[in-house]
């Protein structure tokens, strides 16, 4: 799930149908933040991981996703919204083994950026794509606050203030 | 879908616990609310409990409601009733990134 | 404690006329645009009209439009026909996980 001017879009064989209302959640519109004018075009670029999915030059694979690391500096906004413009998101992790993978890809030990902030609407730590934190499988550490935004370093995930500058990982 | 029940006739100072259940989806994921609204009035917010399983309410009902949830059904506590209390008692989901609720139940009407 | 205070409390228009209803909260709400519309008619639960202020609800008439940010909002119902006839509220979404709704205005149809 990727995000617009407040339209979630769902990616099906590489198409895309705006959707305002999923039966599941009932998404109407994707975080609180800053966010550009991107074509539903441009942006239905995620794709399901029994596709075959051929990333761009400088970009990583990995169970049907691909991932790019960056090496400059930006707060958490800027973070997102350069990922954005690339027709991708902010990393959202669904599992360990997607922990893993990226860990072993971080060639430093310091803060990356993850697709991760808290909202005080609903008092809750929510991913990029609307979707709540899975507490059983994260924990995240430090405060849980307005303007807080989620760093990982070494398979953790952090509260950090979202103005801070680290690198990160975008995926689609 | 949502269903509210446990709403029935009760005299004043009676605790009554009302049930949302839930079809289609999990709670777990969803902040949900309370709503009610007393015969010909407007609507008024109760309280809501977030994906994580905290509560908030507004300010005249702390202490008297409590919401508590399981993965299917949302449960609103109620204690020391009065007839102000009469009211039909909505639940409703809000959308998983804004305020807005775009999933109601029907309502169950609780009369003190 | 918030106040949501919605103008006014009723409302009479002829068919194909136009209607406006006010919304103030004496709090801004999360985002400036944390504002939702809601439709009810006797016997049923709301229906959401309109989210984050100007935003329509799938399968909702363009008839229907929200406008406004941070405590002042705009609810304008235009070219009305009898199935407008109903109570209209609104919501506000506020931080620390915070809602309000307003006193409602009905409706009424000529």
């Known amino acids: 799930l990727l995000v617009s001017q407040g339209v979630l879009l769902k990616c099906q064989k590489g198409s895309c149908s705006n959707a305002t209302q999923y039966e599941d959640t009932g998404d109407l519109k994707v975080n609180n933040g800053t966010r550009r004018n991107i074509s539903n075009k441009d942006l239905c670029a995620s794709r399901s991981a029994d596709q075959t999915v051929l990333c761009q030059s400088e970009w990583l694979k990995y169970q049907g996703k691909c991932y790019w690391f960056s090496n400059e500096m930006k707060s958490w906004s800027d973070s997102y919204v350069y990922c954005l413009e690339r027709k991708s998101h902010l990393l959202i992790i669904h599992d360990q083994l997607e922990m893993a993978f990226i860990q072993k890809n971080l060639r430093q030990l310091n803060y990356v950026w993850i697709g991760l902030n808290f909202t005080s609407l609903k008092m809750t730590w929510t991913w990029v794509d609307g979707s709540p934190i899975d507490s059983k499988i994260f924990f995240i550490k430090g405060p849980a606050k307005e303007n807080s935004c989620a760093a990982i370093k070494e398979s953790k995930i952090f509260s950090e203030t979202c103005s801070s500058v680290f690198k990160w990982i975008c995926q689609y | 879908s949502l269903e509210e029940s446990g709403g029935r006739l009760v005299t004043p100072g009676t605790p009554l616990t009302l049930t949302c259940t839930a079809s289609?989806?999990?709670?777990?994921?969803?902040?949900m609310n309370w709503v009610r609204q007393s015969p010909g009035k407007g609507l008024e917010w109760i309280g809501a409990?977030?994906?994580?399983?905290s509560a908030y309410y507004a300010s005249w009902a702390k202490g008297r409601f409590t919401i508590s949830r399981t993965s299917t059904t949302v449960d609103l506590k109620m204690t020391s009733l009065t007839t102000e209390d009469t009211a039909t008692y909505f639940c409703?989901?809000?959308?998983?990134?804004?305020?807005?609720?775009?999933?109601w139940g029907q309502g169950t009407l609780v009369t003190v | 404690q918030i106040v949501v205070t919605q103008t006014p409390a009723s409302v009479s228009a002829a068919v194909g006329g136009t209607v406006t209803i006010s919304c103030q909260s004496s709090?801004?709400?999360?985002?400036?645009?944390?504002l939702s519309w809601y439709q009810q008619k006797p016997g049923q639960p709301p229906k959401l009209l309109i989210y984050?202020?100007?935003t329509l609800s799938s399968g909702v008439p363009s008839r229907f439009k929200g406008s406004g940010s941070g405590t002042q909002f705009t609810l304008t119902i235009s070219d009305l026909e009898c199935d407008d006839a109903a109570a209209y509220y609104c919501?506000?979404?506020?931080?620390?996980?915070?809602?309000?709704f307003g006193g409602g205005t009905e409706v009424v149809v000529k």
């Open positions: 984050l202020a100007s």
């Open positions: 409703a989901r809000e959308a998983a990134d804004t305020s807005a609720n775009n999933l």
């Open positions: 289609g989806f999990s709670l777990f994921s969803a902040y």
């Open positions: 409990i977030n994906s994580g399983g």
């Open positions: 709090q801004n709400l999360y985002g400036n645009k944390e």
């Open positions: 919501a506000g979404g506020y931080s620390g996980g915070m809602r309000a």
